[in-house]
């Protein structure tokens, strides 16, 4: 049923009215306003922005707008004792030092409180030693080094290029390899697109530009000192030694000018193959240590950052639902930035602001959504998704009973090529139907739908004529809602052409050069891509909050479950002899998936036919849809990752940004040939198949007729 039927509204107040109210010029104005000074989590500037947003959301017409504060562990450089890396000679003299700050962009030379590049939550330390180049520091890179090249990183300082995987995974891998320090750098191969000038003349990374970022391995814990519970005024805090996810070795990021100075002297083994070479004019030798003439020189890190419990502020706005006020649709994105946040997060925050304004306009004209909409401006996302996680921990009982959906709203753009969507399969049909109704902003697709341009530019690898929709991973504020609480979630943004641009993320990510001008000059001068993203995010929220029957299609979950079962089975079948020896069978999982498919099909038939004028039956059917995602939650969580509780999806253990399907089975199978005790290892595979099969079967039964 269409949204117009929701709450006795006049035809004017339908989805079209909401979408028509969204204006590119407003998004542009809001972005400018949000990006003139830094808004680092825990600072006065970010508190002031929180209060400004609270005030403006109230003006826009929300029913209530409150600040929710928490006292969480954050990390800052020491203002009087800067972090840097040096090359030292045999006498211990520093013969080269890395830069202490990024050269500020034009027009920002006099801005104060620009935090210098640092790796948030690095411990203090001054390790010195030989350097080992570890490529991207992925699991497979360390396998190559340790197993194939027999290079031992124990007691070494490793240098890794940013890209491919979340930086926290790089640090974890280095720690496990025995390294005593990590240097992270941006290689032009990954952060300098050919044929484009560096900022301020283009959108590429200059040699002095550096990517900031946290290096935690929280696995969904939130504040490291209060895992599982909100960091409120009566919180019990762990000691720092028991804190969750903190790195144990010093880490520091540098740009490619400084990296050149370190890498040009590298000796030892040659790179194993071309995939280990970047674009600098250096040999990309692996080491350990420097070559011939420089072999007595060492690298020394000087890290003096401190971890501090600091107050953060979320802004929570409420637009009460007229019919089902106890059902929540949440639109959330973060407000804190590393520096100016021109893309991350303010291109997203500006879109949320305009969505709130549009909803507020409709509300002032007498309209209300069917369900309650919650709007959130999260704090401290950059420090480990802390604001969203603490709020969800504080409100978990309400959310698990009332949460319909969560739509994430971080950066609206990471390119200007096509749409990118990651979401639960329950939302596939919603996204397809919505994008068919929206106009494409793309050149060459005038008068065509967004669905058409998206499908053409980013086709599904499985289904012809459909666009690619990816699995949810992590690295953003949907994590607690989806991976911990099992609330249906989705995210949308405009992205680059992944086939022609092999660099990781966008070049100026988390640098001082992520400014308003970057967006206005190079990415989206007309703010048409921002407007499209606002329409997608806002349209999803509108439909989720307003349609009589929730716009979830459980049959799409059945399809992907079969695909994921096939995939994990084929991985296991690379070990046919062991499967036979240890009697490993996937029959229970395939049987559960078959049952789910049949029950989902029957449920969908009932959904077409039931009496929608009967509020009890309507509520019952909607609750079955709402609670389906919840049914995939295992209260015990995944092995060693208690806050990742979704059995179908979890962030990859090797890359927090990526989603993995049937993660429990996947991790049990991963590198199983190198596990010393095959009986124990295959026993765990069998246990994980059992958990997955049970969970799928249990989820299927929630869709059965209730009596």
């Amino acid at each position: 049923k269409s949204s117009n039927e929701a709450t006795n509204i006049t035809p004017k107040h339908n989805m079209k009215a909401f979408l028509d109210e969204l204006k590119a010029e407003n998004i542009k104005k809001f972005l400018y306003n949000f990006t003139q000074i830094p808004h680092l989590a825990g600072t006065e500037q970010n508190f002031q922005l929180a209060k400004q947003i609270q005030s403006q959301w109230k003006e826009f017409g929300l029913d209530s707008v409150e600040l929710a504060h928490y006292d969480v562990l954050l990390s800052y450089p020491n203002k009087t004792h800067p972090n840097y890396i040096s090359i030292i000679n045999e006498d211990g003299n520093e013969i080269f030092n890395t830069s202490l700050f990024e050269p500020p962009p034009p027009g920002y030379e006099n801005v104060s409180d620009i935090v210098p590049p640092f790796s948030a939550f690095s411990p203090q330390g001054m390790p010195e030693g030989d350097l080992v180049y570890v490529n991207y520091a992925r699991t497979e890179d360390f396998f190559k080094l340790e197993r194939d090249m027999k290079i031992n990183c124990s007691g070494k300082i490793v240098i890794a290029r940013y890209g491919k995987v979340f930086r926290g995974n790089k640090v974890k891998n280095a720690q496990l390899a025995g390294a005593k320090g990590v240097i992270l750098y941006s290689d032009p191969a990954d952060y300098f697109a050919p044929g484009v000038k560096s900022y301020p003349d283009g959108w590429n990374l200059p040699g002095g530009g550096v990517q900031r970022g946290n290096i935690l391995n929280l696995n969904g814990a939130g504040d490291p000192l209060t895992p599982g519970y909100p960091a409120n005024e009566y919180a019990y805090r762990r000691g720092i030694a028991e804190a969750v996810g903190l790195p144990s070795i010093p880490v520091h990021p540098i740009g490619y000018y400084d990296a050149q100075k370190l890498l040009e002297k590298m000796g030892g083994s040659a790179p194993p193959d071309s995939s280990w070479r970047g674009s600098l004019k250096v040999p990309y030798n692996v080491g350990p240590g420097f070559t011939g003439n420089f072999s007595t020189q060492k690298v020394k890190m000087h890290i003096h950052s401190t971890n501090e419990v600091t107050r953060i502020y979320n802004v929570i706005g409420t637009l009460r639902g007229a019919v089902e006020p106890d059902r929540y649709v949440i639109l959330g994105g973060h407000r804190d930035s590393w520096v100016f946040g021109g893309i991350d997060p303010q291109s997203g925050a500006a879109v949320v602001h305009e969505i709130v304004r549009s909803f507020g306009t409709l509300k002032k004209e007498g309209w209300r959504p069917r369900r309650t909409i919650l709007f959130a401006s999260w704090d401290a996302e950059e420090f480990g998704l802390l604001g969203s996680t603490e709020w969800a921990e504080e409100n978990s009982r309400l959310l698990q009973e009332r949460g319909v959906a969560y739509i994430n709203a971080d950066s609206s753009i990471e390119g200007n090529y096509t749409l990118r969507v990651d979401c639960t399969p329950l939302m596939y049909s919603l996204v397809h139907n919505l994008t068919k109704e929206l106009k494409s902003p793309d050149e060459g697709f005038e008068g065509k739908s967004l669905y058409e341009s998206w499908t053409k530019k980013s086709p599904s690898p499985e289904f012809s004529g459909m666009p690619r929709i990816s699995k949810l991973g992590s690295g953003n504020d949907f994590e607690v809602f989806f991976q911990r609480l099992g609330i249906a979630s989705g995210r949308a943004r405009y992205t680059k052409n992944w086939e022609t641009n092999k660099f990781s993320g966008y070049p100026l990510y988390h640098s001082v050069y992520e400014t308003y001008e970057l967006v206005e000059k190079f990415y989206d001068p007309m703010f048409k891509y921002h407007l499209t993203v606002a329409q997608v995010r806002g349209g999803m929220v509108f439909e989720l909050a307003n349609s009589i029957v929730l716009p979830f299609d459980c049959r799409d979950y059945a399809v992907v479950l079969r695909k994921y079962a096939d995939k994990i089975y084929s991985i296991s079948m690379k070990h046919p002899q062991e499967m036979k020896t240890y009697s490993v069978s996937f029959d229970s999982l395939f049987s559960a998936v078959k049952n789910f498919t049949e029950i989902a099909s029957k449920f969908s038939e009932r959904l077409q036919d039931f009496d929608k004028s009967n509020p009890i039956v309507l509520r019952m059917m909607n609750d079955q849809l709402m609670f389906l995602e919840r049914a995939f939650i295992d209260p015990l969580g995944l092995p060693d990752r208690p806050f990742y509780r979704h059995v179908i999806y979890a962030p990859s253990s090797h890359n927090k940004y990526a989603g993995e399907s049937f993660p429990g089975i996947y991790d049990a199978l991963f590198d199983i040939e190198s596990k010393v005790d095959p009986s124990k290892a295959w026993g765990e595979v069998k246990r994980q198949i059992y958990v997955a099969a049970f969970t799928v079967q249990a989820a299927a039964e929630t869709l059965s007729e209730v009596a």
Epitope: R147, S154, K574, H575, Q577, E578, S674, V676, P678
Partner: antibody, heavy 116, light 107 residues
Framework: EVQLLESGGGLVQPGGSLRLSCAAS????????MTWVRQAPGKGLEWVSE????????YYADSVKGRFTISRDNSKNTLYLQMNSLRAEDTAVYYC?????????WGQGTLVTVSS | DIQMTQSPSSLSASVGDRVTITCRAS??????VAWYQQKPGKAPKLLIY???NRFSGVPSRFSGSGSGTDFTLTISSLQPEDFATYYC?????????FGQGTKVEIK
């Protein structure tokens, strides 16, 4: 159940050659690194050589480098050790073992005696 | 190369005794230590890996401990079938070196 069966040992003169084989069963041989370890009569254990699952990477103890060659035929589930320029100090029981670093399953061994 | 030094080289004990064998590495080997049991004329068998993890089927009377450079294998209550030679091995870096062995004999 994992089984490793070495063969090819015997008496050989110094400077001579010998090729040891190890037939593997009970596991998916082509997925695993394999290792040769030897034990001189009445002495301790000595790691000799390792090979990667595809056979693309090989490693040797300094004492045998340049003289011994490890190889494998994954289609036949068989590991080999070609031993050239044999010396008296190469006399030992040669074991093939599954895995690398840590050896979870071993064959029963084959005795190589280098003597004139 | 990393040297592994075992002590004692032999010991005599009775059934039911608690037996401790130590192994010292010439440098820090982190958690890269395994222990093997070998009976005369037989191949070695893996007992303990990564310092303290018992391999499948190994009785609970066998335990491993230690860190850095000093490691211990303990048999809490010696059984008749435990009379054998025990080897420690470092697996941090190649060449993967073994201790010279500790022979456990019947008193």
């Amino acid at each position: 159940e994992v089984q490793l069966l070495e063969s090819g040992g015997g008496l050989v003169q110094p400077g001579g050659s010998l090729r040891l084989s190890c037939a593997a069963s009970g596991f998916t041989f082509g997925n695993y690194r394999m290792t040769w370890v030897r034990q001189a009569p009445g002495k301790g254990l000595e790691w000799v050589s390792e090979i990667s699952p595809s056979g693309g990477y090989t490693y040797y103890a300094d004492s045998v480098k340049g003289r011994f060659t490890i190889s494998r035929d994954n289609s036949k589930n068989t590991l080999y050790l070609q031993m050239n320029s044999l010396r008296a100090e190469d006399t030992a029981v040669y074991y093939c073992a599954k895995g690398f670093r840590i050896f979870d399953y071993w064959g029963q061994g084959t005795l190589v005696t280098v003597s004139s | 190369d990393i040297q592994m030094t075992q002590s004692p080289s032999s010991l005599s004990a009775s059934v039911g005794d608690r037996v401790t064998i130590t192994c010292r590495a010439s440098q820090d080997v982190s958690s890269g230590v395994a222990w093997y049991q070998q009976k005369p004329g037989k191949a070695p068998k893996l007992l303990i890996y990564k310092v303290s993890n018992r391999f499948s089927g190994v009785p609970s009377r066998f335990s491993g401990s230690g860190s850095g450079t000093d490691f211990t294998l303990t048999i809490s209550s010696l059984q008749p079938e435990d009379f054998a030679t025990y080897y420690c091995q470092q697996n941090l870096a190649p060449p993967y070196t073994f201790g010279q062995g500790t022979k456990v004999e019947i008193k």
